[in-house]
């Protein structure tokens, strides 16, 4: 499996100039064993490729060594001197290109780097005449020249002209993060995403931004309903309120009362906190019977007793649960007209003589009711 | 051609620990997340968790968080299941899966493993 | 978690038959659902992923549709290599989730 890459190190060569096309060693490229000392060399120029090493910082180069940070090559670009389109926008392009394995600029090198780029690096470019018939040896070296510095990951390029002991190279180098790395060490990973993993983009500096509707670090908390009381209630998708067991309502607000509470509230689920004057596991007993019902009569005084229960104390000549009941009802001679009191449970009743009636035989039924035959029934009055 | 290779499977003792490997080729294992996906016999699919190998995030399905450990090393391509504590209900077969990015919600599991069966016995 | 119901959990169909498997998500998961063919003593494949887009190689008779809550799973001609069990899972909420299972067999 590919590794792939936290970045690029990007060498693009915009020319090199090798005026006697001669190599380093002061032979002809072509070999025919005349050097420049002895009048020049030949009609065949130099078939000039380049190999690039990157290393780690040395202040002073050491070209033998493996290249720890990468290596590359270009095809044969030209012969003794030639120049090539400056990076830009084509370089970008090819760079595009080389990741997905198309055609790229043959002038330019895309060194990528699995590590934690050090900032601090090691170049060393070589020109070299190609030879169909040998391996690359020191023999086909034309140039050899090195660069010890910083560089930044940006996407500018930065110039660097070398002028060695038979060619001139001018190139342009920059460092890249790859798409998802982020840092001036490109080793930052932030990949936008929408699922499971998390909801969010990435901004310019490699950092989470969550989408609408998700946060926390990973952007995997959705944002609930505004209003919604998170402690009672929360959601796993944005927008919703969903209550916790024991709580209701549009933003999990309210709790959920002991079931069967008839006057009563709560304020913590499954109480039922008794509304005034009642009372009982359900707030269904009336704790003040006297003050919804005035049960007592006569002028009796209600006292609350057990929820649902009263006392009514009753005043004198009065009993009974609600004081209906007058006490020796017959002794302050009620009856008149010559009536006759008798005492019944509810008070007293009056049998009145013929001629009278009504609660006491206070009424002459001839003047009253002359409709009324004298000696109609019993007339009571209770107390 | 991608594969996902998984080892490690067995028997084990309850309470017991074991270690799946999950091992990666033809594709690029930093730019994709790594499953582990289990099935018990004759039952349906559950995932078990995950990881993103490029920074070592990893997520877990509560019926095996604090007992299972997902990890990966990007040099060998490889992912890691470590799992302790094992109990009965932990017998199954585990396969191990890639995730399908798409710029659509979701992440789809693409290519599996062959699965490894692990059974925890006494 | 999210739960996600197949319906049914079983049906016996014939070479040619049309059919379709639905899924319910307990809560809204967007278009985040794929759909995996899976037979005996092998692994899953993928179908259908965010919901409705077909995975390269998978025969174009599979379609799916749907989006928040509930997902279809549609074969249009069946065919004797799609008698398997198929699962819907979603990947919008974590954990992931799978439906139980739909086992195709032969009428």
């Known amino acids: 499996a590919d590794l792939g890459s936290m970045g690029y190190f990007e060498l693009q060569l915009s020319a090199l100039r090798n005026v006697n096309g001669e190599l380093l060693s002061g032979a002809c490229c072509d070999g025919d064993g005349r050097t420049t000392r002895a009048g020049g060399c030949g009609r065949d120029e130099c078939d000039t490729y380049v190999r690039v090493c990157l290393k780690e910082y040395q202040a002073k180069v050491t070209p033998t060594g493996p290249c720890s940070y990468g290596y590359g090559a270009t095809p044969v670009l030209g012969g003794n001197s030639f120049y090539l389109p400056p990076a830009g926008a084509a370089g970008d392009r090819a760079r595009a290109r080389s990741r997905t394995g198309g055609h790229q600029d043959p002038g330019l090198v895309v060194i990528p780097f699995q590590f934690a780029w050090p900032r601090s690096f090691t170049l060393i470019v070589e020109a070299w005449d190609w030879d169909n018939d040998t391996t690359p040896d020191e023999e086909l070296l034309i140039e050899r020249v090195s660069h010890a510095g910083m560089i930044n990951p940006e996407d500018r390029w930065k110039s660097l002209h070398f002028s060695g002991h038979v060619a001139h190279l001018e190139l342009q180098i920059r460092v890249r993060c790859d798409e998802n790395y982020y840092s001036a060490t490109c080793n930052k990973f932030c990949r936008p995403r929408n699922d499971f993993f998390g909801h969010y983009t990435c901004d310019q500096y490699g950092n989470k931004a969550c989408m609408d509707g998700w946060m926390g670090k990973e952007c995997k908390e959705a944002v609930c309903k505004q209003g919604c009381n998170l402690l009672h209630g929360g959601c796993t998708v944005p927008g919703e309120c969903r209550c916790s067991y024991g709580w209701q309502g549009k933003f999990c607000d309210e709790c959920v009362p002991y079931p069967g509470c008839v006057h009563g509230s709560c304020v913590e689920p499954w109480h039922c906190d008794c509304e005034t004057n009642w009372g009982g596991l359900l707030c269904d007993k009336d704790l003040n019977y006297c003050g919804s019902h005035h049960p007592c009569v006569n002028g009796g005084t209600c006292i609350n007793a057990e929820p649902d229960q009263y006392l009514c104390a009753c005043p004198d000549g009065y009993l009974g649960k609600n004081c209906e009941r007058a006490e020796h009802a017959c002794a302050s001679n009620p009856c008149a007209n010559g009536g006759s009191c008798h005492e019944v449970p509810s008070g007293f009743e009056c049998h009145c003589p013929s001629g009278w009636n009504g609660p006491t035989c206070a009424l002459d039924i001839d003047e009253e009711f002359g409709l009324v035959p004298r000696g109609s029934g019993h007339h009571h009055h209770h107390h | 051609e991608v594969q996902l290779v998984e080892s490690g499977g067995g028997l084990v003792q309850p309470g017991g620990s074991l270690r799946l490997s999950c091992a990666a080729s033809?594709?690029?294992?930093?730019?994709?997340?790594i499953h582990w996906v289990r099935q018990a016999p004759g039952k349906g699919l559950e995932w078990v968790g995950g990881?993103?190998?490029?920074?070592?995030?990893?997520d877990y399905a509560d019926s095996v968080k604090g007992r299972f450990t997902i990890s990966a090393d990007t040099s060998k391509n490889t992912a890691y299941l470590q799992m302790n504590s094992l109990r009965a209900e932990d017998t199954a077969v585990y396969y191990c899966?890639?995730?399908?990015?798409?710029?659509?919600?979701?992440?789809?599991?693409?290519?599996w493993g062959q699965g490894t069966l692990v059974t925890v016995s006494s | 978690d999210i739960q996600m119901t197949q319906s049914p959990s079983s049906l016996s169909a014939s070479v040619g038959d049309r059919v379709t498997i639905t899924c319910r998500a307990s809560?809204?998961?967007?278009?985040?659902v794929a759909w995996y063919q899976q037979k005996p003593g092998k692994a899953p494949k993928l179908l259908i992923y965010?919901?409705?887009f077909l995975y390269s190689g998978v025969p174009s008779r599979f379609s799916g549709s749907g989006s928040g809550t509930d997902f279809t799973l549609t074969i249009s001609s069946l065919q004797p290599e799609d008698f398997a069990t198929y699962y819907c899972?979603?990947?919008?909420?974590?954990?992931?989730?799978f439906g139980q299972g739909t086992k195709v067999e032969i009428k």
């Open positions: 033809g594709f690029t294992f930093t730019n994709s997340d």
């Open positions: 899966a890639r995730s399908y990015w798409s710029s659509s919600p979701g992440s789809a599991f693409d290519y």
């Open positions: 809560q809204d998961v967007s278009t985040a």
């Open positions: 899972q979603q990947s919008y909420i974590s954990p992931s989730t």
């Open positions: 990881i993103t190998p490029a920074d070592g995030y990893t």
């Open positions: 965010s919901a409705s």
